[in-house]
């Protein structure tokens, strides 16, 4: 069981300093950017992270929104992730949702983020590149250390 | 209690190739892989790669990558590793171990290599 | 790849004595740090996890310390069963890599 607390905005960034941002085609790409250009890609650039109570702690459940024209969520089902146009729901009466990920910082550094799915144990968000796009995937991990999963969050409430 | 329980000793002659094999028994749950390391005589533990029973994707040691071939049969949750173009100093106990996630008190997660086999003695000897 | 480098490769204790193993990784591995203990014609046993977490049924005077690129594993008084080798092994990126070990011994 999940249920929603409160949200902040965010700037989502991976550990070579590209933001996170969702293009024209709904698509969550990284890319380098000024902190003028962040400002300027807003509200693409900044990601609403909604916190949720969770039933059997696992450490900080988060869903993952964005709000352009419509506000759209961050999903993982079937492991492929995607922008769903929904709003993050209240309560969630289950312990797995492809949309509900725990944000957990790396051990040592405060400031350094995982993501792992709630629905796959072992699956993370992870930075990849893919011809010339840097793209936010799910990727299964066993090496923990890899840099591709870990990412910076700073706040912008 | 998961145990793994590894084939017996070898003994090869040097340019040969050996395969031992790993059968899982008892519960165990997904989200594991299987890895290899091998003790040579007198010598420290040396880790020679994994594969992942899901898709049998494999990462091998860079010595051992043109040599080593690990896999794995799900029908009967056993895993391989076949080691060729055998030398002297191939000689060692091998072992497979699984690779599982451990959590602690926040959820956060670590791999730990918990269950091993009891070991194979591979002798390369001509 | 990542270097671990153990020290000392050997020790000679006494029961009752406390003593301290050191691993020292090439590069920060985050905690992604295990202890294992073999005896002579055994496999490895898990020891400690997460650099600090001590396995289920491991004895509490085993415990583990360290971030960053530094850990330590130390036994605080000696036991005649803990006679035997020890290695740590890093779990941050592949491939991975123990160190060299350090065989415990009777004084």
């Known amino acids: 069981y999940f249920g929603k607390l409160e949200s902040k905005l965010s700037i989502i960034r991976n550990l070579n300093d590209q933001v996170l941002f969702i293009d024209q085609g709904n698509r969550p790409l990284f890319e380098d950017m000024t902190d003028s250009d962040c400002r300027d890609n807003a509200p693409r650039t900044i990601f609403i992270i909604n916190m949720y109570k969770d039933s059997q702690p696992r450490g900080m459940a988060v869903a993952i929104s964005v709000k352009c024209e419509k506000i759209s969520t961050l999903s993982c089902e079937n492991r492929i992730i995607s922008f769903k146009e929904m709003n993050p729901p209240d309560n969630i009466k289950d312990t797995k949702s492809d949309i509900i990920f725990f944000q957990r910082s790396v051990p040592g550094h405060d400031n350094k983020m995982q993501f792992e799915s709630s629905s796959y144990e072992g699956y993370f968000l992870a930075c990849e590149k893919e011809r010339d796009l840097y793209k936010l995937i799910l990727k299964k991990k066993d090496e923990l250390g890899d840099r591709s999963i870990m990412f910076t969050v700073q706040n912008e409430d | 209690q998961v145990q793994l329980v590894q084939s017996g000793a070898e003994v090869k002659k040097p340019g040969a190739s050996v395969k031992v094999s790993c059968k899982v028994s008892?519960?165990?749950?997904?989200?594991?892989?299987f890895h290899w390391v091998r003790r040579r005589p007198g010598k420290g533990l040396e880790w020679m790669g994994r594969i992942d029973p899901e898709d049998d994707s494999t990462k091998y040691a860079e010595r051992f990558k043109d040599r080593v071939t690990m896999t794995e049969d799900t029908s009967t949750d056993t895993a391989y590793m076949e080691l060729s173009s055998l030398r002297s100093e191939d000689t060692a106990v091998y072992y497979c171990?699984?690779?599982?996630?451990?959590?602690?008190?926040?959820?956060?997660?670590?791999?730990?290599?918990?269950?091993w086999g009891q070991g194979t003695l591979v002798t390369v000897s001509s | 790849d990542i270097q671990m480098t153990q020290s000392p490769s050997s020790v000679s204790a006494s029961v009752g004595d406390r003593v301290t193993i050191t691993c020292l990784a090439s590069e920060d591995i985050y905690t992604y740090l295990t202890w294992y203990q073999q005896k002579p014609g055994k496999a490895p046993k898990l020891l400690i996890y997460?650099?600090?977490k001590l396995q289920d049924g491991v004895p509490s005077r085993f415990s583990g310390s360290g971030s960053g690129t530094d850990y330590t594993l130390t036994i605080s008084s000696l036991q005649p069963e803990d006679f035997a080798t020890y290695y740590c092994l890093q779990g941050s990126k592949f491939p991975l890599t123990f160190g060299q070990g350090t065989k415990l011994e009777i004084k």
């Open positions: 008892g519960e165990i749950s997904t989200g594991y892989y």
């Open positions: 171990t699984t690779w599982r996630i451990y959590r602690d008190s926040s959820g956060r997660p670590f791999y730990v290599m918990d269950a």
């Open positions: 997460g650099a600090n």
